[in-house]
Amino acid sequence: AWELTILHTNDVHSRLEQTSEDSSKCVNASRCMGGVARLFTKVQQIRRAEPNVLLLDAGDQYQGTIWFTVYKGAEVAHFMNALRYDAMALGNHEFDNGVEGLIEPLLKEAKFPILSANIKAKGPLASQISGLYLPYKVLPVGDEVVGIVGYTSKETPFLSNPGTNLVFEDEITALQPEVDKLKTLNVNKIIALGHSGFEMDKLIAQKVRGVDVVVGGHSNTFLYTGNPPSKEVPAGKYPFIVTSDDGRKVPVVQAYAFGKYLGYLKIEFDERGNVISSHGNPILLNSSIPEDPSIKADINKWRIKLDNYSTQELGKTIVYLDGSSQSCRFRECNMGNLICDAMINNNLRHTDEMFWNHVSMCILNGGGIRSPIDERNNGTITWENLAAVLPFGGTFDLVQLKGSTLKKAFEHSVHRYGQSTGEFLQVGGIHVVYDLSRKPGDRVVKLDVLCTKCRVPSYDPLKMDEVYKVILPNFLANGGDGFQMIKDELLRHDSGDQDINVVSTYISKMKVIYPAVEGRIKFSTGSH
């Protein structure tokens, strides 16, 4: 028998520095977690103790903090090189700055193979990107060879900016021939490493003949065997065992997100490359693990540029940006409108001639808007200003919901109106009318939504049975502020870009902004 240790991360999302327990900015260092310096300590400890170790990343290193905003992926290549990752799969967020924003900072600088078998380049891009990412890589590990085959969510064109010259094929269809090829070349230990979410990971384990282990990402899935060490609730045991269609037991793993855990899986293979056993657990990277001093020193050196960036002007406002709780928790506020407009603008994807865009709607809990911005400071807006408005380090995500769920969400928005509670919704691409004289749960008297399958966008009444795409904060997607119906009834959830980054990009693009209160949210006469 031959034993392999797989160390894995996924959805790190720019958390190069240690973070608080909820993966936001580290405040009390003695209770902080993760970060590349701490990760390196643990990885090196395991590499020294065990003979056959692979360090793998399942995508979405890009996007999530000011580190990515400023360094645009150069930080990913630099620190992943320093940690000596063995391979990485492309995630959807790796395309957030377009193909060029992937090629230059990461693909050309990474000193580890970057993989995806289901992304095919065409047209002029084919020769430009040739060899910069691979469908698979065969790695020598100890006295054996291991094949790593990559995959990426085929939804990426709707979630990011890969352009028109990359085709995202069905994962299973693309993986099978690559695995078959490796088998014919006597590579009998194969890991599928990719970024399509836990459901697809399980399908790959079930359907792709010859895959021995699946290491996934995208869905931020936390798996654990035994008592979990922090706040995350396990979605299943680690590893999650799938019985393949040809009768094999295939371990599937994922390691939550944000570099909080290091996935640790031990696999035992027989001489024919069959998995005999698999066991392990994610390792919580808490403060009991010291940060490596040399990596930490490097982080501090790179940090300097971030502090300078925070105070630079992104753009100007010529109006007061009302982000006060007195406004945003009671009525339409122009800060809410600005943020929602930025959220939609960030998700413009012309992937189908029938649609002007794939999504037109935004909802945003008023309680998530934490500060106004005064225009009387020469109109200047900085990252620092935006960090005061959106201090929680969240993301603006894409969900699919039925109209009936949206209706429930808007009823919840005003079910206890007047108490300055955070669930009051700010909107974009939606016209809502409330009648507060009616009883809670029956206060939405009009709900019109902007069409997507149209050449001239207009507002139509919400249809209860129709499925709609909506951009919203991850906080709401996860049922925050009492929006349990969203969490329970959503049909799809893809995590998006860092909230501050979305707004800052929009302001930089617009240069001068003047959001108004324009009647997106109304109250019936006599009721307010």
């Epitope: 590499r47 000193k111 193979p113 040739s130 020598p140 100890g142 090829k181």
Partner: antibody
């Protein structure tokens, strides 16, 4: 700068063994695998095997059917290639070559001529 | 094992010429191809890896291209010091295999 310095030429009888050394300098020895390649007179280059200096893990070309053994001494930043049961067709120049992150050979030793003759 | 076939086996060209050497793999090798230059009595020198990535310090007149099974080494403007034998190597899978070499002479 990266350098690989190999041991000197050897003359061996058929059936004997030869051990060639390769001392690396100018980089962290454990950061890169080491490959061994040979070239018989007038022939193409032929890959023999690979070693990982971190754990001594080796992968060999099956053509050499257990005749080749690659080892390392990390404290001396040195790799060794031993070929046993020598025959006349093993007369060749033997090269060590460091591999880069992509496992492609990038820096080569100067070569060691091994002559097998009765 | 994967077979690597180079063409031509030998060629001669003049200083300043554009020179192209091809290498064909018996199956798709996933861009895992490198090129080496060997002068008589010397160790090989690596020029290119991953089909098109130039090794640091190699003159920019050398370039690599290709994918799948067909690869090309191009010298944009031949120099006298480029007289050598050139080898391709596939390192996609084990065992690594070399082409038979292309001997380049100066007219």
């Amino acid at each position: 700068q990266v350098q690989m310095k190999q041991s000197g030429a050897e003359v061996k009888k058929p059936g004997a063994s030869v051990k060639v050394s390769c001392k690396a300098s100018g980089y962290t020895f454990t950061d890169s695998n080491m490959d061994w390649v040979r070239q018989a007179p007038g022939q193409r280059l032929e890959w023999m095997g690979d070693i990982n200096p971190n754990n001594g893990g080796t992968i060999y070309n099956q053509k050499f059917k257990g005749r080749v053994t690659i080892t390392i001494d990390t404290s001396a930043s040195t790799a060794y290639m031993e070929l046993s049961s020598l025959r006349s067709e093993d007369t060749a120049v033997y090269y060590c070559a460091r591999t880069n992150w992509d496992y492609a050979m990038d820096y080569w030793g100067q070569g060691t001529l091994v002559t097998v003759s009765s | 094992d994967i077979q690597m076939t180079q063409s031509p086996s030998s060629m001669s060209a003049s200083v300043g010429d554009r020179v192209t050497i091809t290498c064909k793999a018996s199956q798709d090798i996933n861009s895992q191809l490198s090129w080496y230059q060997q002068k008589p009595g010397k160790a090989p020198k690596t020029l290119i890896y991953r089909a098109n990535r130039l090794i640091d310090g190699v003159p920019s007149r050398f370039s690599g291209s290709g994918s799948g099974t067909d690869f090309t080494l191009t010298i944009s403007s031949l120099q006298y010091e480029d007289m050598a034998t050139y080898y391709c190597l596939q390192y996609d899978v084990f065992p690594r295999t070399f082409g038979q070499g292309t001997k380049l002479e100066i007219k």
